[in-house]
């Protein structure tokens, strides 16, 4: 048969109508629609543009175009009594109080519902105490001011400063270290780049600015209180005590003008060392405390917001496949923003509108895909990636027999440098293959391909000429597609010069400034990275979905497996004298990568001679490569994390926006020297040897002929 | 045009009270801190109050501490001071003040001024 049995229009032609039909200036017009009013999770407005979008889906010209909605946990500030954090005097008079909201931006000063600064999902309290400056809170800053200068958290009020990593992660090492507050602040040397302005003249933070997000530690879970199942309408839920990843102990977010004044007193200890100074015009003193002429004020915080069950609503649109109408392809990004949402979402939900309508035309026009492709708006990513966990909650049955891929579809733009991929190895190939099919946007490289100028600007660090692509952490909706259910996932967006820009993510994210203003006049005002991007995730799509043979390599698969073998071993090999007194082999995991390397490769040349005109055999390759993901799902999860299954990568422990190789693995050797009971800890880093070498050699045999 | 316009002054007895009203035009009030700051006749000026952007935090002149309070209503742009236990000293032309930084939390330089009100306090 021809490549193009399930459409009228030439092959050759297919992938390139589907790119020519993508317009920058659509994507443009769409994100200033989206960015006009908050649409924060679980809001009105938020429940208006779902519909709005299903009707302009239809009109698009998917075959149909439905809400599912979900009741899940979500958090909001008390309208009438605010959230704020104070220093106090020896009397209990406040003296000073951090900002209520933000300034608005110019033009914005009139709009109602704009949610003020919160850390979503604290608890309620009013805790007072000294201060203890934590530097990040990372796993490694807890450990220095513990371990090295014997400084004690307990009972203390921590200020630790955004980037790095997930500032759930912040909260939980805080918690674990003892403290009863915790203070999140945005440092200039994080999130304000040099040379640049701050908004509105520019892309930089201004003092003013405050970074919202939830502080939950769910690992996967989804809605908090049905973890697992769907939030439905016969739902059974947990009550809040019981309820999954929430933090115990209150938390508030602050800007550098709010942070100047709290660090401007500290006392105590200097900082360890550069590492710990931000570019505040403050000493950095960790504390506890102030110093001496302020050493009876305290810090007092002020946290009144409340957690409520509410209706949230995901878009779910279909384009059936014409010959595979049971294997789905799934584009999604999320709706739901904090506040305007100028870059995440909209900049990633404006792209994705602009791939329905370029698909939903030639659908008019008589091509259908191969493959049933899905099409999501989620619900309520910024409160838990809730929306997307809880549908696939519901259709996890569904899924993971018939999901071929997930693209995940959030913020289009971190930056206006070069592009940034993070995937399945199986989508290494489809990836290099089809940017050296598109035109680079990048100044300098006019008429060079996107492969290349992504290869000069961001190249591998193991394979010369090629890109870096990056593991899956998470953080974003693929989570529950790639961690629990083992669905070939990717991801792609225009991002920032990691080498010279250290701050973390972009400055304005999950502040009132992030406007669609901001990405007209300062990210892509001719939004040609943005319709890069949607060639990128469009392009993807198109091919996961049309092409004859799934274009997935499992011999890239082959490749990284012993890359994450070698790198275990040598974390493991730190220790040589326990690895012998303990029996520690990783024999076992070497020969199952070399088994899966052989059998990947065997089936690699199948894949090259079998008869594509056999229906029968044709599908049944394709399925191999399409459950070849599935097979690295351990059922029965990793420990104490049932949601994260997946065997070869889960999100790292110390940071979730991270992935981490063989995180079994890692995870019992991570501190292994400071475990009480030595025999047991080795005991538990040879189990899970074991459990990943048994999964790559089980994965591998999905591979083998099947009789 | 960007504008402040001052209100509310008078001749008033010692004791008494009075309360200044200061309306912008022109900029959003809900972004800037606000400052009130007084020129007695003869002398220099002297600063008076301060409120933050969101009326958060407000700060005071020793002399006017327990006596006068500052206030604003974003929604209607306009700018309060009420000055209750009013003494002769406390006589000057009173001038609102916009805070030259977006969302400052203590006083800064000052760029729009209004053209003042006189407060007079006699007996």
């Known amino acids: 048969k021809s490549s193009n049995e399930a459409t009228n229009i030439t092959p050759k032609h297919n992938m390139k109508a589907f790119l020519d039909e993508l317009k920058a200036e659509n994507i443009k017009k769409f994100l200033y629609n989206f960015t006009q009013i908050p649409h924060l999770a679980g809001t009105e407005q938020n429940f208006q543009l779902a519909k709005q979008i299903q009707s302009q889906w239809k009109e698009f010209g998917l075959d149909s175009v439905e809400l599912a909605h979900y009741d899940v946990l979500l958090s909001y500030p008390n309208k009438t009594h605010p959230n704020y954090i104070s220093i106090i005097n020896e009397d209990g008079n406040e003296i000073f109080n951090t900002s209520l909201f933000e300034p608005p931006p110019p033009g914005y000063e009139n709009v109602s519902d704009i949610v003020p600064p919160f850390s979503a999902f604290s608890p309620q309290g009013m805790p007072e105490g000294d201060l203890v400056y934590v530097n990040y809170a990372r796993t490694e800053d807890f450990f220095k001011l513990e371990r090295d200068m014997k400084i004690n958290c307990s009972g203390k009020i921590v200020i630790a400063r955004y980037g790095k990593v997930f500032r759930g992660n912040k909260v939980k090492n805080a918690q674990l270290a003892g403290a009863k507050g915790v203070i999140l602040y945005s440092d200039p040397a994080d999130y304000f780049a040099p040379g640049v302005k701050s908004y509105p003249d520019g892309w930089n933070l201004p003092g003013g600015g405050v970074q919202r997000g939830n502080i939950l530690n769910l690992n996967g879970a989804g809605d908090p209180l049905t973890p697992g199942y769907p939030a439905n309408e016969y739902a059974y839920r947990r009550g809040i005590a019981e309820a999954v990843g929430l933090p115990s102990i209150p938390v508030h977010p602050i800007g550098y003008y709010d942070a100047q004044k709290l660090l401007e007193k500290m006392g105590g200890s200097a900082p360890p060392d550069s590492s710990w100074r931000g570019s505040l015009k403050v000493p950095y003193n960790v504390g506890p405390g102030f110093t001496g002429n302020f050493s009876t004020q305290k810090v007092k915080m002020h946290i009144h917001s409340t957690n409520e069950v509410t209706r949230i609503y995901n878009v779910i649109g279909t384009l059936r496949g014409a010959v595979e109408p049971d294997r789905y392809v799934i584009l999604g990004g999320h709706r739901d923003s904090w506040v305007f949402g100028g870059i995440d979402p909209q900049s990633g939900a404006a792209v994705v509108h602009e791939i329905v309508r370029s698909f939903g035309t030639l659908k008019k026009e008589g091509w259908r895909p191969r493959r049933t492709i899905l099409f999501a708006s989620w619900d309520a990513e910024e409160f838990g990636l809730l929306g997307s966990t809880e549908w696939a909650e519901e259709n996890s049955r569904l899924l993971q027999e018939r999901g071929v891929a997930y693209i995940n579809a959030d913020s289009s733009i971190e930056g206006n440098y070069t592009l940034r991929v993070d995937c399945t190895p199986l989508m290494y190939s489809l990836v290099h293959n089809l940017t050296k099919e598109l035109k680079s946007p990048d100044e300098g490289f006019e008429g060079k391909s996107l492969y290349e100028s992504w290869t000069k600007k961001s190249p591998s660090p193991e394979f010369s000429g090629m890109p870096r692509i990056s593991k899956l952490g998470s953080g974003n909706d693929f989570e529950v597609f790639f961690q629990r259910l083992g669905i070939a996932s990717g991801r792609a967006r225009y991002t920032k010069n990691w080498e010279t820009n250290k701050f973390s993510g972009y400055p304005l994210y999950h502040s009132v400034y992030e406007t669609y203003e901001l990405v007209e006049k300062f990210y892509d005002p001719m939004f040609k990275y943005h319709l890069t991007v949607a060639q990128v995730r469009g392009g993807m799509v198109f091919e996961l979905a049309n092409s004859i043979v799934l274009p997935f390599d499992c011999r890239d698969y082959a490749v990284v497996l012993r890359k994450y073998a070698d790198k275990i071993y040598s974390i493991s090999m730190k220790h040589p004298q326990e690895m012998k007194t303990y029996s520690v082999s990783f024999d076992s995991l070497f020969s199952a990568v070399k088994n899966f390397t052989e059998i990947a490769s065997k089936f690699s040349e199948r894949l090259q001679d079998f008869d594509k005109s056999n229906p029968i055999v044709l599908r049944m390759m394709n399925d191999q490569l399409m459950f070849l993901e599935r097979a690295f799902i351990d059922p029965l999860g990793l420990p104490d994390r049932p949601f994260y299954r997946h065997v070869i990568y889960a999100p790292s422990s110390h940071n979730k926006y991270a992935g981490e190789s063989f995180p079994g693995i890692y995870d019992a050797l991570f501190d292994i020297e400071s475990k009480v009971d030595p025999s047991k800890a080795w005991g538990e880093v040879k189990r899970q040897i074991y459990v990943a070498a048994f999964t790559v050699q089980a994965a591998a045999e999905t591979l083998s002929e099947v009789a | 045009e960007v504008q402040l316009v001052e209100s509310g002054g008078g001749v008033v007895q010692p004791g008494r009270s009075l309360r200044l009203s200061c309306a912008a035009s022109?900029?959003?009030?809900?972004?800037?801190?606000m400052n009130w700051v007084r020129q007695a006749p003869g002398k220099g000026l002297d600063w008076v109050a301060f409120?933050?952007?969101?009326?958060?935090?407000?700060y005071y002149a020793d002399s006017v501490k327990g006596r006068f309070t500052i206030s604003r209503d974003n929604s209607k742009n306009t700018l309060h001071l009420q000055m209750n236990s009013l003494r002769p000293e406390d006589t000057a032309v009173y001038y609102c003040?916009?805070?030259?930084?977006?969302?400052?939390?203590?006083?800064?330089?000052?760029?729009?001024w209004g053209q003042g009100t006189m407060v007079t306090v006699s007996s």
């Open positions: 022109g900029f959003p009030l809900i972004s800037y801190g």
């Open positions: 003040a916009k805070d030259r930084i977006v969302g400052a939390r203590v006083p800064d330089a000052y760029d729009i």
């Open positions: 409120i933050t952007y969101d009326g958060s935090n407000r």
